[in-house]
């Protein structure tokens, strides 16, 4: 054996953002021929010996960080990248608006503003079709998301979520969609 066994992949299907009471499947995938998997929920001391975890109805207690490994012979693989499973719909939806407005000229600037009546300190913005949240290096997880020098690629449908840093995997319902039009 030269070097550690390669890490498996861990994914959530259909998405790692799961509305409460909706189903989700966590799947750990290693090399062909591997059948001994361990799927762990971090910070909970628990694990199961299967590659697939089917959750028929998402609960608050199932939100959190997951990781998996596999065993080949007596050797363990490197762990997968952590998967963050988020329960959405735990709190009421925030509102999403665009300043100065949802129609913006190419090359112009726009700021997407996520507002909630709760005292949340964290916000996530998603663009429809993108699996990962919109990340602005300066203002990730803030209430406002400035988009400097808008291009046609920025046009699309956006939604935001709000949550607390104390419970980072329990999110609000998504805001109503906001259509950003680049002219």
């Amino acid at each position: 054996q030269s070097g550690p066994l390669p890490k498996p992949s861990l994914q959530a299907l259909p998405s790692s953002l799961v509305p409460l009471e909706k189903p989700v499947t966590l799947r750990c995938q290693g090399p062909p021929g591997v059948d001994l998997y361990r799927l762990e929920k971090l910070s909970s001391s628990r694990y199961q010996d299967q590659a697939v975890l089917f959750i028929p109805a998402m609960k608050r207690s199932l939100a959190g960080r997951y990781r998996c490994s596999y065993q080949n012979g007596s050797l363990w693989s490197l762990p997968s990248d952590q998967l963050e499973l988020v329960a959405t719909g735990v709190f009421a939806k925030p509102s999403l608006s665009a300043q100065p407005g949802p129609a913006v000229s190419s090359g112009g600037d726009v700021t997407l503003q996520c507002q909630t009546r709760y005292g949340f300190d964290q916000f996530a913005l998603y663009k429809e079709g993108d699996p990962a949240p919109y990340k602005n290096p300066e203002r990730w997880y803030r209430a406002s998301f400035p988009i400097i020098t808008v291009t046609a690629a920025h046009s699309g449908t956006y939604r935001c979520y709000s949550f607390s840093s104390r419970d980072p995997y329990l999110w609000s319902a998504p805001s109503d969609p906001l259509e950003l039009v680049v002219t």
């Epitope: 001994l36 762990e40 001391s45 628990r46 694990y47 199961q48 010996d49 490994s69 363990w76 762990p79």
Partner: antibody, heavy 123, light 112 residues
């Protein structure tokens, strides 16, 4: 109530072999991970080996790998530890311990322990 | 040499509060694994005292509490009683080879 009773300990010469057994009762044995944990005289606890509920997942401490073999017989509600090539430093009380389980999840801690069986390796 | 580090001994007078620390690394406690604590009274097998960093099994008095932060954890005992005199062990899991790891143990002496 949950009971774990170890047996098979005794005096053995260096290089010799011994087989420990742990008889489990009062719970569904086949649902739980099980481990052997040892404690040298006057020293702390050292995890030795664990086996998954179906006997597929097996792990050993580096200090015993290649010399000790853990196994289980779910039909007999029994856990075993075959110890070969014994050394003086293997002298210890050997405990059988159950891992907590809830629904489909196993947990990384031990909720019940046996009273232990003493293994002495000496010439 | 234990993977998790505990002080060899602590002591306190009856009624006092004592804490026992448990320090690990980024491959065990810092890798998202919880810390569990066991009490071993003289001449007996270990008994689960705290699981999942801060949870008490039924029957364990609320004088015992646990916490975890980063790569370390601690066990606090308030209102010390003579029957608390025992060895205390922390335990976690290590990601490297999926092994269970213990601290070296701490002997608690109740003075007087």
């Amino acid at each position: 109530q949950v009971q774990l009773v170890e047996s098979g300990g005794g005096l053995v010469k260096p290089g010799g072999s011994l087989r420990l057994s742990c008889a489990a009762s009062g719970f569904s044995f086949s649902d739980h991970y099980m481990s052997w944990i040892r404690q040298a005289p006057g020293k702390g606890l050292e995890w030795v080996s664990s086996v998954g509920s179906e006997g597929k997942f097996i792990d050993y401490a580096a200090s015993v790998k290649g010399r000790f073999t853990i196994s289980r017989d779910n039909a007999k509600n029994s856990l075993y530890l075959q110890m070969n090539s014994l050394r003086a430093e293997d002298t210890a009380v050997y405990y059988c311990a159950r891992h907590y389980r809830e629904f489909r999840w196993h947990y990384y801690y031990f909720d019940y322990w046996g009273q232990g069986t003493l293994v002495t390796v000496s010439s | 040499q234990s993977v998790l580090t505990q002080p060899p001994s602590v002591s306190g007078a009856p009624g006092q509060r004592v804490t026992i620390s448990c320090t690990g690394s980024s491959s065990n406690i810092g890798a998202g694994y919880d810390v569990h604590w066991y009490q071993q009274l003289p001449g007996t097998a270990p008994k689960l005292l705290i699981y999942g960093n801060s949870n008490r099994p039924s029957g364990v008095p609320d004088r015992f509490s646990g916490s975890k932060s980063g790569t370390s954890a601690s066990l606090a005992i308030t209102g010390l009683q003579a029957e608390d005199e025992a060895d205390y062990y922390c335990q976690s899991h290590d990601l490297g080879a999926h092994v269970w790891v213990f601290g070296g143990g701490t002997k608690l002496t109740v003075l007087g």
